[in-house]
C-alpha cells in the first residue's frame, strides 16, 4: 500500500512539475523591466524565450517573436534547449510511469517490469527537473550579469553629451515557476525511484520447503535467510511478497538490481 501511495504521489508531483515546466517555457515573463531606481518610462518591457513584449500604459500589449535563430545569444539558445529537453524527457517519463502505476493493470505485466518502468520514469523525471532548474538558473545568471553591467554603464557615463538610459531587466515570474516546477519534477522522480525499490521482488518467490530433522524443526529457506530455529509455525521469516513492507530479518536478503538508484 505504501509503495502504491509513493508511486502515485510521485506521478502526481511529477505531472504538476512538468506542467509547470511547460508553462514556464511558454511564459513571456522570463525577464521584466526593472522599475526600481530606474527613470520611469510610460511603457513596460518584458521578455520570454520566444518573444519580447511591450505593454503600453493604456494596457495595449504588443509582442514580437524572435524570428531569427542565428542572431540570438548562445545562452538563450542553450536555455531553450534545456527546457525543451526537460519537457520531452518529462513527457516520456509520464507516459512510461502511467503504465508502471501499480493501480493500473495492463495484461499480465509482471511486477519486475513495472519496477523497471517506475525506475526508468523516475530517472527521466529527475533529469527533466535538473534540465529545467539548470535552464532557469543559466537564464537567471545571464540576467544578473547584464543587470550589473547596465548598472555600471548607467553610472559611468558614456563620455558624450547625450545620456543613455539602459533598460535593466530583473527576474520575471517564469523563473520562479521554472524553479518550483523543476524542483517538483525532481522530487517526483525521487519518489518514483523510492517506489521502485518496494515494487521489485527480491528474487523468485519459491515455496519454502521444510526438512524435518530430529529434535527441533529447522526450516531451510532459499535466498540467504537465517534459518529459523523455532518450534511450530514461524510466520516471521516466510518470504511473502508484501509490496515493500519488510521484516527485520529481510535486511540480510540478497540485494536486487533495483536497490541501487
Amino acid at each position: 500500500m505504501a509503495v502504491t501511495a509513493c508511486q502515485g504521489l510521485g506521478f502526481v508531483v511529477s505531472l504538476i512539475g512538468i506542467a509547470g515546466i511547460i508553462a514556464a517555457t511558454c511564459m513571456d515573463q522570463w525577464s521584466t523591466q526593472d522599475l526600481y531606481n530606474n527613470p520611469v518610462t510610460a511603457v513596460f518591457n518584458y521578455q520570454g524565450l520566444w518573444r519580447s513584449c511591450v505593454r503600453e500604459s493604456s494596457g495595449f500589449t504588443e509582442c514580437r517573436g524572435y524570428f531569427t535563430l542565428l542572431g540570438l545569444p548562445a545562452m538563450l539558445q542553450a536555455v531553450r534547449a534545456l527546457m525543451i529537453v526537460g519537457i520531452v524527457l518529462g513527457a516520456i517519463g509520464l507516459l512510461v510511469s502511467i503504465f508502471a502505476l501499480k493501480c493500473i493493470r495492463i495484461g499480465s505485466m509482471e511486477d519486475s517490469a513495472k519496477a523497471n518502468m517506475t525506475l526508468t520514469s523516475g530517472i527521466m523525471f529527475i533529469v527533466s527537473g535538473l534540465c529545467a532548474i539548470a535552464g532557469v538558473s543559466v537564464f537567471a545568471n545571464m540576467l544578473v550579469t547584464n543587470f550589473w553591467m547596465s548598472t555600471a554603464n548607467m553610472y559611468t557615463g558614456m563620455g558624450g553629451m547625450v545620456q543613455t538610459v539602459q533598460t535593466r531587466y530583473t527576474f520575471g515570474a517564469a523563473l520562479f515557476v521554472g524553479w518550483v516546477a523543476g524542483g517538483l519534477t525532481l522530487i517526483g522522480g525521487v519518489m518514483m525511484c523510492i517506489a521502485c525499490r518496494g515494487l521489485a521482488p527480491e528474487e523468485t518467490n519459491y515455496k519454502a520447503v521444510s526438512y524435518h530433522a530430529s529434535g527441533h524443526s529447522v526450516a531451510y529457506k532459499p535466498g540467504g535467510f537465517k534459518a529459523s530455529t523455532g518450534f511450530g509455525s514461524n510466520t516471521k521469516n516466510k518470504k511473502i511478497y508484501d509490496g515493500g513492507a519488510r521484516t527485520e530479518d529481510e535486511v540480510q536478503s540478497y540485494p536486487s538490481k533495483h536497490d541501487y538508484v
Partner: antibody
C-alpha cells in the same frame, strides 16, 4: 465622435482654488487615460499629469505636485483638475486630452479653459 | 526631466516648398523592446488646441495628409512637410512620451514670407 468639453474661462483671485472640468463623450471614458496640459499665453506646452478613470491611478509631473489634483467622476464621464494656491504664474490655458490606445500620445484635445488669476 | 530642443524657430517658407524641422531629445526615446521611438509631433494653429500629427516618430495619425512625414531614431528626429500649404502655417511641437514627465519642445513656428 470623440468630444472633450471644457468651460471657456475661469476668473479666480490669487490664493484661491479652481476646479476645471472636462466632460468626455463619444468613447468609453474608463478605457483611456486623461491628460492635462498647461499653456501660458504665447508659450509652449507643459504636461501636468494624467489619470486613468477606471481606477483613478495617476501620474504627476513633479513640478505640479501639490499644485494640481486630478480626479474623475465615472457616473458623469467627467475629469477634473483642481488647482490650489493660485498665483499669476498659474494664469494659462489648461487643456484636457485623451490618451491614445496604441501609443502614449494625446489623440484628442479639449478646447481648453483659460484660467485668469487676478485680484 | 528629458529636454526637447526644437529648431529652427521661426521657419519662414513659401507655399509649395519642402520644409524640414528638427527635434533633439536629451535621452534616447527608442524602446528596444519593440524598436519604437516614443516621439510625437503636434500641430497647433492660433486659438486652437494642438492636433496629433505623428506618433512613434514616423506613424501618421489617420486623417493627416501624407505630405507630413516623420523620421529619425534615438535622439534626433525630423518632421518634413513635402509641399507646404497655406493651412499648414502653425506651431509644431515635438513631445517625449516615453519618460515621465512627458515633455514638449519649445515649438517651431511656420511662417509665410
Amino acid at each position: 465622435q470623440v468630444q472633450l468639453q471644457q468651460p471657456g474661462t475661469e476668473l479666480v483671485k490669487p490664493g484661491a482654488s479652481v476646479k476645471v472640468s472636462c466632460k468626455a463623450s463619444g468613447y468609453t471614458f474608463t478605457t483611456y487615460w486623461m491628460h492635462w496640459v498647461k499653456q501660458r499665453p504665447g508659450q509652449g506646452l507643459e504636461w501636468i499629469g494624467r489619470i486613468r478613470p477606471s481606477d483613478s491611478d495617476s501620474n504627476y509631473n513633479q513640478k505640479f505636485k501639490g499644485k494640481a489634483t486630478l480626479t474623475v467622476d465615472k457616473s458623469s464621464d467627467t475629469a477634473y483638475m483642481q488647482l490650489n494656491g493660485l498665483t499669476s504664474e498659474d494664469s494659462a490655458v489648461y487643456y484636457c486630452a485623451m490618451g491614445a490606445y496604441f501609443s502614449n500620445s494625446f489623440a484628442y484635445w479639449g478646447q481648453g479653459t483659460l484660467v485668469t488669476v487676478s485680484a | 526631466d528629458i529636454v526637447m530642443t526644437q529648431s529652427p524657430s521661426p521657419l519662414t517658407v513659401t507655399a509649395g516648398e519642402k520644409v524640414t524641422m528638427t527635434c533633439k531629445s536629451s535621452q534616447t526615446l527608442l524602446n528596444r523592446g519593440n524598436q519604437k521611438n516614443y516621439l510625437t509631433w503636434y500641430q497647433q494653429k492660433p486659438g486652437q488646441p494642438p492636433k496629433l500629427l505623428i506618433y512613434w516618430a514616423s506613424t501618421r495619425e489617420s486623417g493627416v495628409p501624407d505630405r507630413f512625414t516623420g523620421s529619425g531614431s534615438g535622439t534626433d528626429f525630423t518632421l518634413t512637410i513635402n509641399s507646404v500649404q497655406a493651412e499648414d502655417l502653425a506651431v509644431y511641437y515635438c513631445q517625449n512620451d516615453y519618460f515621465f514627465p512627458f515633455t514638449f519642445g519649445s515649438g517651431t513656428k511656420l511662417e509665410t514670407r
